[in-house]
């Protein structure tokens, strides 16, 4: 019952079992997703404009399942995807065609996550396996950062696929799966 | 604007294999959960199988061995083999709330007839 | 195989009336609320109405209603349109051997 899907590289299961605080109560409709919440915050960089419009980083809210191979999560969890661009596109003009063209010029931000929580879900599995206590690393709030050639670069990905650590002691499955079935799927509502 | 639709529907002899294909846009299949639903004539709707974002797939008992979800990059597929009369339905793709199972298929596709006749 | 079983298969109400429809699963759902409700009407693919036993889906009325926990579940339809005459739908997710999915028969509701 309930089929969507959106991965989130930011996002990932945390094998160590620590003190975290508690979730956060889960969304009462969905009409708190996809919630701009921060489509007019202040700029996180010394650019120098009257427009704070053109800054566009976004925290969108989301809702998802976490999954691992056949295994999800009980419940739903709720985080953000950092959406838009971040710093004035300068008007400049196009000796072409003589009119006005769009150009990012100055420092490259981003808008990608800055804070992250931990939150604990209990994983279920098929065939009568015990359910999982794990970790998974949300995002929590996203800002316009500068880019340096020392930025993780995965921070910048557009939500693609993400690899899964090793689960230790896992039993093999006899069901065929496809190769990409064993990563840790971040499944969400967008 | 987010949209599925089904093809490959036709009229096909007992025992013939058919493939279903859904074409999604709009959204990424890489990261989205489809399910196929089928509707016979007149009748309710029957769940087939889903396939998850990392490409893990569950099936209904009966569809077992019979039924197949794979999916490209803009396209689900449901692939049927040994086709009956019973198998006469319209074919749902469908795309939902949650990933995974869990809440609520929200986006469907209008469906294609197949029609299983000697 | 799961089984849901809903009651009663046709029902007829009038305009102003109030509805209720019931679903009954031959085991518990996933988390217990791992059920939603759909509507649909001829021609059409369904709608999603509730999900998480309880949840409004976007866009649908508040007249809606949907409870229950477990094995046992209602929707309720209160102030009823002309526009709710439909067939409506619980589907249920489950957890055994392997993850499925499961609709319920089916209810007709006839407006007068």
């Known amino acids: 019952q309930g089929w969507q899907a959106f991965k989130n590289d930011a996002t990932e299961i945390i094998p160590e079992l620590g003190e975290y605080p508690e979730p956060p109560p889960e969304l009462e409709n969905n009409k708190t997703m996809n919630r701009a919440e921060n489509g007019g915050r202040p700029p996180h960089h010394p650019f120098e404009t009257k427009d704070v419009s053109e800054y566009s980083c976004r925290e969108l809210h989301f809702t998802r399942y976490v999954t691992d191979g056949p295994c999800r999560s009980a419940k739903p969890v709720t985080e953000l995807v950092c959406s838009g661009q971040c710093g004035p596109a300068r008007l400049l003009p196009n000796a072409i065609g003589r009119g006005k063209w769009w150009r990012p010029s100055g420092p490259d931000f981003r808008c990608i996550p800055d804070r992250y929580r931990a939150q604990r879900v209990q994983l279920l599995c098929p065939g009568g396996e015990a359910p999982r206590a794990r970790k998974v690393r949300l995002v929590a709030s996203c800002k316009c950062k500068r880019l340096t050639r020392f930025h993780n670069q995965s921070e910048l990905k557009d939500f693609g696929t993400e690899a899964a650590r090793p689960q230790k002691g896992r039993k093999p499955r006899p069901r065929a799966r496809s190769a990409k079935a064993n990563q840790a799927e971040l499944e969400n509502a967008y | 604007c987010q949209s599925v639709e089904e093809s490959g529907g036709r009229l096909v002899t007992p025992g013939t294999p058919l493939t279903l294909t859904c074409k999604v846009s709009g959204f990424s299949l890489s990261s989205s959960v489809m399910n196929w639903v089928r509707q016979a004539p007149g009748k309710g709707l029957e769940w087939i199988g889903a396939?998850?974002?990392?490409?893990y797939t569950y099936y209904a008992t009966w569809a077992k061995g019979r039924f197949t979800i794979s999916r490209t990059s803009t396209t689900v597929d449901l692939k049927m083999t040994s086709l009956t009369a019973a198998d006469t339905a319209t074919y749902f793709c469908?795309?939902?709330?949650?990933?995974?199972?869990?809440?609520?298929?929200?986006?469907w596709g209008p469906g294609t007839l197949v029609t299983v006749s000697s | 195989a799961q089984l849901l079983t809903q009651t009663p298969p046709s029902v007829s109400a009038a305009v102003g009336g109030t509805v209720t429809i019931s679903c009954q699963s031959s085991?518990?759902?996933?988390?217990?609320?791992?059920l939603a409700w759909y509507q649909q009407k001829p021609g059409q693919p369904p709608k999603l109405l509730i999900y998480?036993?309880?949840t409004l889906a976007s866009g649908v009325p508040s007249r809606f209603k949907g409870s229950g926990s477990g094995t046992q579940f209602t929707l309720t339809i209160s102030d009823v349109q002309c526009d709710d005459a439909a067939t409506y739908y619980c589907?249920?997710?489950?957890?055994?051997?392997?993850?499925?999915?499961?609709f319920g028969g089916g209810t007709e509701v006839v407006v007068k």
């Open positions: 589907q249920g997710t489950y957890l055994s051997d392997d993850w499925s999915d499961a």
């Open positions: 998480f036993a309880s």
């Open positions: 469908a795309r939902g709330q949650f990933g995974a199972s869990g809440g609520g298929d929200v986006l």
């Open positions: 085991q518990s759902v996933v988390n217990n609320n791992n």
């Open positions: 396939i998850w974002s990392g490409g």
